[in-house]
């Protein structure tokens, strides 16, 4: 910390002088500053065997200022403290100690963790993630047509990364199986197998999850009512089978 020192006025006699230079209000040749101008701190500086009074604009590192009507003094911070406002309020601890609410601690209290960069005890921060974004379109090898079994994906963002002792982030990507939209591929996006292109268009109301796999379409002799019942049964089975597969990087 910058401390501007009041220079001592050298005089022939060790008596008190009012003609002091710098920050001294009163001084003597032998003892240096005896008192300081307003807003300056009085401190004793050892020079050899002698202690000299000096006036400082702020207390040196490791000391704090105390105000009294007649004098402002510099007092040493606690032994484990580097800088402080007073003995009970440390602002920077000595090496090996962690600062918490103005105190220097060997170890951080329960529920807090040591930040070895700032040398402070900080709150444990747990991971926070956003809501899931909507599922992506169902695709198979990048195609959204044909009647194949494909996959759909959804993602969520990390809002708050965890601290060292915080809970890890849950998966941020999720993938599950689905059936690609039941529509014919256009010329440029055709599937490889010819039989996929011969299938009929689905009814407008059919959702991708309700689409049965190719085997159920082979029983074309059934009357429409029977076929519809079987499709509903198949839909339930497909939904039951759709267990989500999670893929994630641990953060």
């Amino acid at each position: 910390q910058n401390a501007s020192r009041g220079r001592r006025q050298r005089r022939m006699h060790p008596n008190v002088s009012q003609g002091c230079q710098g920050g001294c209000a009163t001084c003597s040749d032998y003892n240096g500053c005896l008192s300081c101008k307003p807003r300056l701190f009085f401190a004793l500086e050892r020079i050899g065997m002698k202690q000299i009074g000096v006036c400082l604009s702020s207390c040196p590192s490791g000391y704090y200022g105390t105000r009294y009507p007649d004098i402002n003094k510099c007092t040493k911070c606690k032994a484990d403290c580097d800088t402080c406002f007073n003995k009970n309020f440390c602002t920077k601890c000595k090496s090996g100690f962690y600062l918490h609410l103005g105190k220097c601690l060997d170890n951080c209290p329960e529920g807090l963790e040591a930040n070895n960069h700032t040398m402070e005890c900080v709150s444990i921060v747990h991971c926070e993630v956003s809501e899931w974004n909507p599922w992506s379109p169902c695709t198979k090898k990048g195609k959204t047509c044909g009647f194949k079994r494909g996959t759909e994906t959804r993602v969520r963002e990390i809002i708050q990364h965890p601290s060292a002792k915080g809970n890890l982030c849950p998966p941020t990507n999720e993938t599950r199986k689905c059936t690609v939209q039941r529509k014919k591929c256009q010329k440029g996006e055709r599937g490889k197998k010819g039989r996929e292109r011969k299938r009929k268009k689905p009814n407008k109301g059919e959702s991708k999850e309700a689409i049965p796999d190719s085997k159920s379409l082979e029983s074309s002799k059934e009357i429409p009512e029977q076929r519809e019942n079987k499709q509903q049964q198949k839909k339930r089975k497909v939904q039951d089978k759709q267990k989500s597969v999670s893929v994630s990087t641990v953060h």
Epitope: Q1, N2, R39, S57, T66, R67, F89
Partner: antibody
């Protein structure tokens, strides 16, 4: 004489950030710690934190720890306080003050912050 | 945190009266023989102004009708005799521990 002059009033939307400045004159800027205190309308005073202008070390009230940043520019004798992720409860007058031997002896005129959507 | 409880929250007085405001800390604000207690005066639309530091010391330029006393957890600010310019809000503040805390204030009004 010691003077602390703060930046003008601010109106911000919730979620935004604000940076208030406090320019010091009349003394050696690095001699005293700068503190920031706020006062919500019709309420009492609340301490936010401090910065040592000599080395930039700062410390914050736990209540604001994750949202406040205090900096200084010794070349212009100016201290700054930035508050992020603003909410309506942050509507207040923000004061800077010099801290001399455990008391706030000089204060800025205050900066009014209004947070409203 | 050290809680500072000021009482009363408001009081009415006439010019020439003697008024006493009290501040009670939830724990001692003394250390090494020093009391880390300050008193401030604030007028509407203005910044606070330091009146008393270290419990009982009058800040330079503050009239001697203001006085402070107390130690440990119990402190008082006395104004005697009250002058017209003293009608304002008064706050106590402890600087012994992190975080620094203020009382809720006492509003001195003209009777």
């Amino acid at each position: 004489q010691v003077q602390l002059v703060q930046s003008g009033a601010e109106v911000k939307k919730p979620g935004a950030s604000v940076k208030v400045s406090c320019k010091a004159s009349g003394y050696t800027f690095t001699s005293y710690t700068f503190h920031w205190v706020r006062q919500a309308p019709g309420q009492g005073l609340e301490w936010i934190g401090y910065i040592y202008p000599s080395n930039g070390d700062s410390g914050y009230n736990q209540k604001f720890k994750n949202r406040v940043t205090m900096t200084r520019d010794t070349s212009t004798s100016t201290a700054y306080m930035e508050l992020s992720r603003l909410r309506s409860e942050d509507t207040a007058v923000y004061y800077c003050a010099t801290y001399f031997a455990n008391n706030f002896d000089y204060w800025g005129q205050g900066t009014t912050l209004t947070v409203s959507s | 945190d050290i809680q500072m409880t000021q009482s009363p929250s408001s009081l009415s007085a006439s010019v020439g009266d003697r008024v006493t405001i009290t501040c009670k800390a939830s724990q001692s604000v003394d250390y090494d023989g020093d009391s880390y207690m300050n008193w401030y005066q604030q007028k509407p639309g203005k910044a606070p102004k330091l009146l008393i530091y270290a419990a009982s010391n009058l800040e330079s330029g503050v009239p001697s009708r203001f006085s402070g006393s107390g130690s440990g957890t119990d402190f008082t600010l006395t104004i005697s005799p009250v002058q017209a310019e003293d009608f304002a809000t008064y706050y106590c503040q402890q600087s012994n521990e992190d975080p620094l805390t203020f009382g809720a204030g006492t509003k001195l009004e003209l009777k």
